[in-house]
């Protein structure tokens, strides 16, 4: 799932369809924050794992998804926009296997932004696709408060101030 100006997109074999309500969670839009006008066509970059995925150069492939690791540093919101402008989104980690893959490919021990931030609207940690974090799988170390964003370091997730500048990971 990727996000455009308040519209969720469902990608089905490379084609896009607008969806204002899903039966499972009733999604209407995704997350709170700065949005750029990116066309639905551009945004429809996600592919399911069972499809053949060709990752762009400099992107790593894993389990049907493509990953890009930055070398420069930005705030969380600037990282968020950077990924969107490249038809991707900040990293959403689904399980510990994916976390292990990420960690293996991180070449430094510093914090790296992922697509998770705290929203005081629902008082929860929320992935950039609008889904809440599964507390049975992941534990976030640090404060859960407004302007808290998540960064990973050594396979752990930490709460950091969103204005801090770190490297980041994009995914599609």
């Amino acid at each position: 799932l990727l996000v455009s100006q308040g519209v969720l997109l469902k990608c089905q074999k490379g084609s896009c369809s607008n969806a204002t309500q899903y039966e499972d969670t009733g999604d209407l839009k995704v997350n709170n924050g700065t949005r750029r006008n990116i066309s639905n066509k551009d945004l429809c970059a996600s592919r399911s794992a069972d499809q053949t995925v060709l990752c762009q150069s400099e992107w790593l492939k894993y389990q049907g998804k493509c990953y890009w690791f930055s070398n420069e540093m930005k705030s969380w919101s600037d990282s968020y926009v950077y990924c969107l402008e490249r038809k991707s989104h900040l990293l959403i980690i689904h399980d510990q296997l994916e976390m292990a893959f990420i960690q293996k490919n991180l070449r430094q021990l510093n914090y790296v932004w992922i697509g998770l931030n705290f929203t005081s609207l629902k008082m929860t940690w929320t992935w950039v696709d609008g889904s809440p974090i599964d507390s049975k799988i992941f534990f976030i170390k640090g404060p859960a408060k407004e302007n808290s964003c998540a960064a990973i370091k050594e396979s752990k997730i930490f709460s950091e101030t969103c204005s801090s500048v770190f490297k980041w990971i994009c995914q599609y």
């Epitope: 308040g6 309500q21 039966e23 499972d24 969670t25 009733g26 999604d27 209407l28 839009k29 995704v30 997350n31 709170n32 929203t119 005081s120 609207l121 629902k122 008082m123 929860t124 929320t126 609008g130 889904s131 809440p132 507390s135 407004e146």
Partner: antibody, heavy 112, light 110 residues
Framework: SLEESGGRLVTPGTPLTLTCTAS????????MNWVRQSPGKGLEWIGA?????SAYYASWAKGRFTISRTSTTVDLKMTSLTTEDTATYFC????????????WGQGTLVTV | QIVVTQTPASVSAAVGGTVTISCQSS????????LSWYQQKPGQPPKLLIY???TLSSGVPSRFKGSGSGTQFTLTISDLECDDAAAYYC??????????FGGGTEVVVK
């Protein structure tokens, strides 16, 4: 879908628990609200419970109302009921990322 | 305590006409836009019309228009139809998990 149950005629001071049962989705990923409507009056937010199980209440409801949940039900426990609590009680699910309630139950009537 | 004031309490207009409902919050809404509008008919639960102040919910005709930001919001219903006769409520979402409804506006279509 959502369905409220437990509403009935009670005497003042009697405690009562209302249950909201969800089908087709898990409440563990939902932000669920309880809203009430007295006869001929407007909608009044009572409180909510988030995906992490934390509950939030309107200032007037704190202490007398308690919201809890399982994967398929959200309960509203009410104590020290008065005639002012006579109302239809609705549960509603918010969209994943806004405060808009895009799924409502039909409501259950509590008469005190 | 959050107070959401909705005006007018009741409004009447002819078929084909336009009605405007105002909603004012005592506190800034989350992101300045976390305002929804609902339509409710007797014996039914509310129905979501507009979210994020101005975004139409699925299946809602474009005759319904939401605007505003911060603490002041407006719902405009143009080209009124008989079926639009109902109660309309605004609702705000706030930091800290808080929510609040306006007092409601009864729309009568002549």
């Amino acid at each position: 879908s959502l369905e409220e149950s437990g509403g009935r005629l009670v005497t003042p001071g009697t405690p009562l628990t209302l249950t909201c049962t969800a089908s087709g989705f898990s409440l563990f990923s939902a932000y669920m609200n309880w809203v009430r409507q007295s006869p001929g009056k407007g909608l009044e937010w009572i409180g909510a419970i988030n995906s992490g199980g934390s509950a939030y209440y309107a200032s007037w409801a704190k202490g007398r109302f308690t919201i809890s949940r399982t994967s398929t039900t959200v309960d509203l426990k009410m104590t020290s009921l008065t005639t002012e609590d006579t109302a239809t009680y609705f549960c509603a699910r918010e969209a994943a990322d806004t405060s808009a309630n895009n799924l409502w139950g039909q409501g259950t009537l509590v008469t005190v | 305590q959050i107070v959401v004031t909705q005006t007018p309490a009741s409004v009447s207009a002819a078929v084909g006409g336009t009605v405007t409902i105002s909603c004012q919050s005592s506190q800034n809404l989350y992101g300045n836009k976390e305002l929804s509008w609902y339509q409710q008919k007797p014996g039914q639960p509310p129905k979501l019309l507009i979210y994020l102040a101005s975004t139409l919910s699925s299946g809602v005709p474009s005759r319904f228009k939401g605007s505003g930001s911060g603490t002041q919001f407006t719902l405009t219903i143009s080209d009124l139809e008989c079926d639009d006769a109902a109660a309309y409520y605004c609702a705000g979402g706030y930091s800290g998990g808080m929510r609040a409804f306006g007092g409601g506006t009864e729309v009568v279509v002549k």
